[in-house]
């Protein structure tokens, strides 16, 4: 797979980690989360041109078949390869609790 | 997550397993694979409307932020949740060998 910065479509156009600032209201969490009031959400965004950050053999197949049958087979998609945990202070019936979520913030990205 | 068949866009339009028939030439494998000559490639294709087969919390966040910022944040993407292994009879310098690949054929799908 090509280096993450070596995007044939131009710098920053290919699959990579982006940060999107979001409030509890944006996320639909205001009724059950107390803190943080704002989250720096890391997510995977960008195009997946041929073999760019291909996650596995399946991604390579998908690239080949997308080239042949673009109307039937979609190009690989930019998704998280791993996650960073995040703690939320949650509202409960009796007060608050700390809860760690392991699948909330993308840590790095690949194409699949 | 909704049941896999409960697609709000109409039957078969949402993220699900599809089979695409492909030759060794289609896959670009003809120079290094001897058998099979044709593969029934299972892959994940289809739309990921709100909370449909959401893989995790990250997918739920992505749905919320895509609704708010559709030009910045893409909708979740239909990708394999797990894989079925496949054996290939590979050409080697001296003849052939059997090689099993664990990440080649999608077994089931989710949105992320």
């Amino acid at each position: 797979a090509r280096n993450g910065d070596d995007c044939p479509l131009g710098p920053g156009r290919c699959c990579r980690l982006h940060t999107v600032r979001a409030s509890l209201e944006d996320l639909g969490w205001a009724d059950w989360v107390l803190s943080p009031r704002e989250v720096q959400v890391t997510m995977c965004i960008g195009a997946c041109p041929s073999q760019f950050r291909a996650a596995n053999m399946h991604a390579q197949i998908k690239t080949s078949l997308h080239r042949l049958k673009p109307d039937t087979v979609p190009a690989p998609c930019c998704v998280p390869a791993s996650y960073n945990p995040m703690v939320l202070i949650q509202k409960t019936d009796t007060g608050v609790s700390l809860q760690t979520y392991d699948d909330l913030l993308a840590k790095d990205c690949h194409c699949i | 997550a909704r049941n896999g068949d409960d697609c709000p866009l109409g039957p078969g339009r949402c993220c699900r397993l599809h089979t695409v028939r492909a030759s060794l030439e289609d896959l670009g494998w003809a120079d290094w694979v001897l058998s099979p000559r044709e593969v029934q490639v299972t892959m994940c294709i289809g739309a990921c409307p709100s909370q449909f087969r959401a893989a995790n919390m990250h997918a739920q966040i992505k749905t919320s932020l895509h609704r708010l910022k559709p030009d910045t944040v893409p909708a979740p993407c239909c990708v394999p949740a797990s894989y079925n292994p496949m054996v290939l009879i590979q050409k080697t310098d001296t003849g052939v060998s059997l090689q099993t690949y664990d990440d080649l054929l999608a077994k089931d799908c989710h949105c992320i």
């Epitope: - | 099979p36 079925n84 009879i89 059997l98 099993t100 054929l105």
Partner: antibody, heavy 118, light 107 residues
Framework: QVQLQESGPGLLKPSQTLSLTCTVS??????????VGWIRQPLGKGLEWLAN???????YYNSALKSRLTISKDTSKNQVSLKLSSVTAADTAVYYC??????????WGQGTLVTVSS | DIQMTQSPSFLSASVGDRVTITCKAS??????VAWYQQKPGQPPKALIY???YRYSGVPDRFSGSGSGTDFTLTISSLQAEDVAVYYC?????????FGQGTKLEIK
Amino acid sequence: QVQLQESGPGLLKPSQTLSLTCTVSGFSLSTYGMGVGWIRQPLGKGLEWLANIWWNDDKYYNSALKSRLTISKDTSKNQVSLKLSSVTAADTAVYYCAQMAYSWFAYWGQGTLVTVSS
Amino acid sequence: DIQMTQSPSFLSASVGDRVTITCKASQNMDTNVAWYQQKPGQPPKALIYSASYRYSGVPDRFSGSGSGTDFTLTISSLQAEDVAVYYCQQYNSYPFTFGQGTKLEIK
């Protein structure tokens, strides 16, 4: 590494049903392209293909024996079974199971001798 | 059923000799033929796949050739450990069939 181990009754009487089991390791019976075949060899004679079962549960039988043969698999136990009904002395042979990959027999078990005698 | 006819049925050769075994199919097989070696008291072992491809671990003195109806297994320089019965097999169509075998001995 790949291993196949046949097990059977050893001795049977005519008209009984032969039940054989092949226990495999080193590969999965659900792997696309994989199968298990049964082949027999009467002592001092050649090889005769009996049946095989594929990863997707497709089954094929030797047409001459089809009415007497049943093949099945239990993927969770890594086992393939073969039943041969109404045996006669002509069914006395070493029975082999073999790993198949796209129609050839890539790796064979050690075989189990089955004798049919009254 | 497809018949696979091997010749010769018996072969005696000296160490170092070049040995050739042939297999003739009763109909066109393309290259869907395999060869196996069975040493005394052992199960068969895969040698050649798709008429001409040596299986991993098989010594390079073994080679296969042919397509259609005529196939050949060649041992370029016979070794004492090659004493065995050799079988061809077609997997072009069901039922799979084997040749009757060629017994190879050392002179």
